[in-house]
Every structure is written in C-alpha cells, then in structure tokens.
Interface confidence: low
C-alpha cells in the first residue's frame, strides 16, 4: 500500500477505494503544494504513467477515468509539474482494489479427526472475491443456547475442549468483505456423529503363487472405534476406472484383503474408512503400488514404494509415504 505517503494534496476514488470488478471508476487528484500552480497533473498506476482519459477540472484538480476496471489491485499516485521544479512533485497516492461480494457459503461440513482434539469446519466459499474476505463461524449449542463465534480467512479448527455445551450444535458461516455479506444455511451436528477414524494405511502387499495367484493387501488403523466400515479401491495404473471392495472391519489386528489380479500388471490401491453408519469418510489413503509377478511370488511392503521392480524374485521396496491420493479431500 501507499497510504503512508506524506501528501501534498489529496487523491480519492469514486465510487470507492474498493469497488466491484468491471465498474467504471474515476480517480481525482487535487494538488496543495506550496508555491506551485501545477502546469500539469500526472497519474501513475503501478508506477506507469497514464496518458489517456485524464481531464483537468480546475487549476489544482484533475480526474482520471477508467472504463470496466478489471485489475484486482493497483497502486495509484499522482504528481504535479511545478514551475521552477526540475522533477515532478508527488501529490498523494492510494491503493485501490476491485473484486466481488462473497457468495453464500455452502456445503458447510464439520468433522472431528480421531485423536486431533479439534472439530474442523470447512465450506465452499464460492467464486474468488479478489479482495480481503473474512468468515465468521458461528457454533451454537442446542442444549445451552450458548453461541461462540470464530473469525477466520478459510477453514477453522475448534478445540473440542471448548465445546462445553453438550453434544448437539448448530453451525453456520457468515462471509463478509467491503462489498457485501452473506450467510450460510445452518448445519445441525452431533459430536458423536462426525468423528472420522484414525487414518487407515496399507502397509504391504504380497502375491501368493497358488493355482490361481492371489494378492493379499495388509492394512491397519490406530482407531479405537469399534464398528468401522471401509472401502478399498484398486485399478491397473493404465486404467481410468476404479474397482471398489467394501469391508466391515475390526482393527484389533492387521487386516488382510485378498484380490485375484492379472499377472505382470502394476496396480494401485487406496483405502478409506468411516464409523459404521455415520456420514463422513476419511480421505483416501496414499497411493500404494504393487506389481503382480509373471509367475513367481512377490512381496511389496509399505517401506518400498519406488517404481523399480525386479522381475522373477520376491521384491521388498520402501515407501517414502509422500504420495498423495488424487482426491484427498473426499470426506463426503
């Protein structure tokens, strides 16, 4: 910003310093320089002198007009050519912004990731506003009527310790910026219904050379939730379409899931879980790759997830754990 200039005059914008993108705007500059009757007044946008649409209004004032202004931000300042001054004299400067009022926030979602100690609330903010937009998340207890408000620029993490008003809450989001304010619909939540189990992780895979070769995927979670439903999806890396298997799971021991796969093909696996009967799923786990052997048994462990495959022998390879799923935000 250039709001701290020691001004020798005044610069202002009509209709306002922050305005709706695409509007026609006027920028006025009025000089108040000692011993100077300006010969000429100049406008600069982002340091570049403007040459068109400038109108001299009177001895000390000029107007710059922009049609359909589309830049999100610009730094404007104006200068005067004073007689007996070799250089232009700075009059004043102003930062201007254009953008949009916020859309109504929708798809408000609140979840508690097991062990996180937080309720995480997110929403779809709608189209880009281009200007500073703040969100106020309202959390109101349906039991005590007590309401808490949280100011944020995006999503919010609310400590579950601060949710002292029982289990049932209403949550809604207000979006506000200089051009407008909107409010979401209210979401009713029960804290017990929004817990997402601790992440499920695929640790290794092996293909057993039986009459029909069988691949076993080993996977686990640290969840303490008793009734958990999971999905494992898999596909050949050359395919677009996923196959999905469903499981009712008890994580008191490592899970083993069996697949009958084509030989000598590279497959990718992912898993996700939810508390049985509840609404929200985990994001899909990291991509886990396994190449089925031509005929000889092969093991792939979570530790070995490079794209290097030894043909013929049992392979163990180590995963860095940084591969991410293609839709890691899928919790709905």
């Amino acid at each position: 910003g250039i709001t701290n200039i020691n001004c020798s005059g005044h610069i202002w914008v009509e209709p306002a310093t922050i305005f709706k993108m695409g509007m026609n705007i006027s920028i006025y500059c009025q000089a108040a320089i000692k011993n100077c009757q300006p010969r000429k007044l100049h406008f600069y946008k982002n340091g570049i002198k403007e040459r068109f649409q400038i109108t001299r209004i009177n001895k000390t004032t000029a107007r710059l007009w922009y049609k359909n202004f589309l830049e999100p931000h610009a730094s404007m300042y104006c200068t005067a050519e004073c007689p007996k001054h070799f250089q232009e004299t700075l009059i004043c400067g102003k930062d201007i912004s254009s953008g949009y009022p916020p859309d109504i926030p929708d798809e408000v979602t609140c979840v508690i990731y097991e062990y996180s100690g937080n309720m995480t609330c997110t929403w779809n903010a709608g189209k880009l506003t281009y200007i500073d937009t703040k969100y106020v998340v309202h959390v109101k207890s349906l039991e005590t009527e007590e309401e808490q408000q949280y100011l944020t620029s995006s999503y919010i993490n609310i400590s579950t310790d601060s949710l002292q008003g029982g289990k049932k809450y209403l949550v809604w989001v207000q979006a506000a910026n200089a051009l407008g304010m909107e409010e979401s619909k209210q979401l009713q939540i029960h804290l017990d219904d929004i817990v997402i189990p601790s992440a499920a992780v695929i640790s290794r895979a092996e293909t057993i050379n039986a009459t029909v070769p069988k691949t076993i995927i080993y996977w686990d979670s640290q969840t303490t939730i008793e009734k958990v439903s999971c999905e494992m999806r898999y596909k050949a890396t050359t395919n677009q379409t996923w196959n999905v298997k469903e499981f009712d799971t008890n994580f008191t021991y490592v899970q083993q899931s069996e697949f009958y796969l084509e030989p000598n093909i590279k497959y990718v696996f992912q898993v996700r879980c939810q508390e049985t009967g509840k609404r929200y799923w985990q994001p899909w786990s990291s991509l886990f790759f396994h190449k089925t052997p031509e005929t000889v048994p092969q093991v792939t462990s979570k530790a070995f997830q490079h794209d290097t495959w030894n043909s013929g022998l049992t392979v163990a390879s180590i995963s860095t754990g940084h591969l991410t799923s293609d839709n890691r935000g899928d919790i709905g």
Partner: nanobody, 124 residues
Amino acid sequence: EVQLVESGGGLVQAGGSLRLSCAASERTVSTYTSGWFRQAPGKERDLVAAIRWSDDFTYYADSVKGRFTISRDNAKNTVYLQMNSLKVEDTAVYYCAGHSFSALIPPVSFWPSWGQGTQVTVSS
C-alpha cells in the same frame, strides 16, 4: 532478501554536510525502490527520501526538500543520500531500506529489506 549495509554517518556541525551510502548485497531488480528512513529517539521511523531504480523517480519529505539528494550507482549497486545544510533536528539514526512493490512509497511495514542503521548527529 537483499542485505543492506549503511555507512557515512557521524558527528557534524549545523550547516555542514554528510554523504550516506547504502550497499546492497545483490543486484536489485528494475522495479526496486530504495529509501532512506530516519528515527529520532522516541519518535517513529519516517521516510526521508526514496528513489525507484527503473526510472529514477524520487520522493522527498517536505522537511528535507532542497537540502537532501538521493541518488544511485547501478554499477556499485549502491544508493546515496547527500545531506547538505544539516540542522540539529536532522539528528537521528538513518536506515536504508528497499522494496519491490509496485507502489513507490508503501507503509514502513511493507519494506522487507533494512540496514542496521547509521547514527547522524548534528551539533549546534
């Protein structure tokens, strides 16, 4: 971030002159603006003069107009503040600063690069 080192401060009598130098650790981009700020004890840090490298556009605070001159040497990557007709009220720590924003003179907090400061004392 560009490292800036000032030099040239000292004690001078009222009416005298000093030349401050500010050397940058690396070549600055053409959109770069260099400035000299000063801070007297108990006062805020104020911009004294600024120069934009792309077109040599300069700015001076009213209190120093006609007495101070800001200039630069591209080859040496250095900015100078020539201070003539010094007054007792010019006594302060002088800081060199720089930024690459499009605005010539953003608020103090927008200047990301700062020198360590050099003391200028003007005695009567």
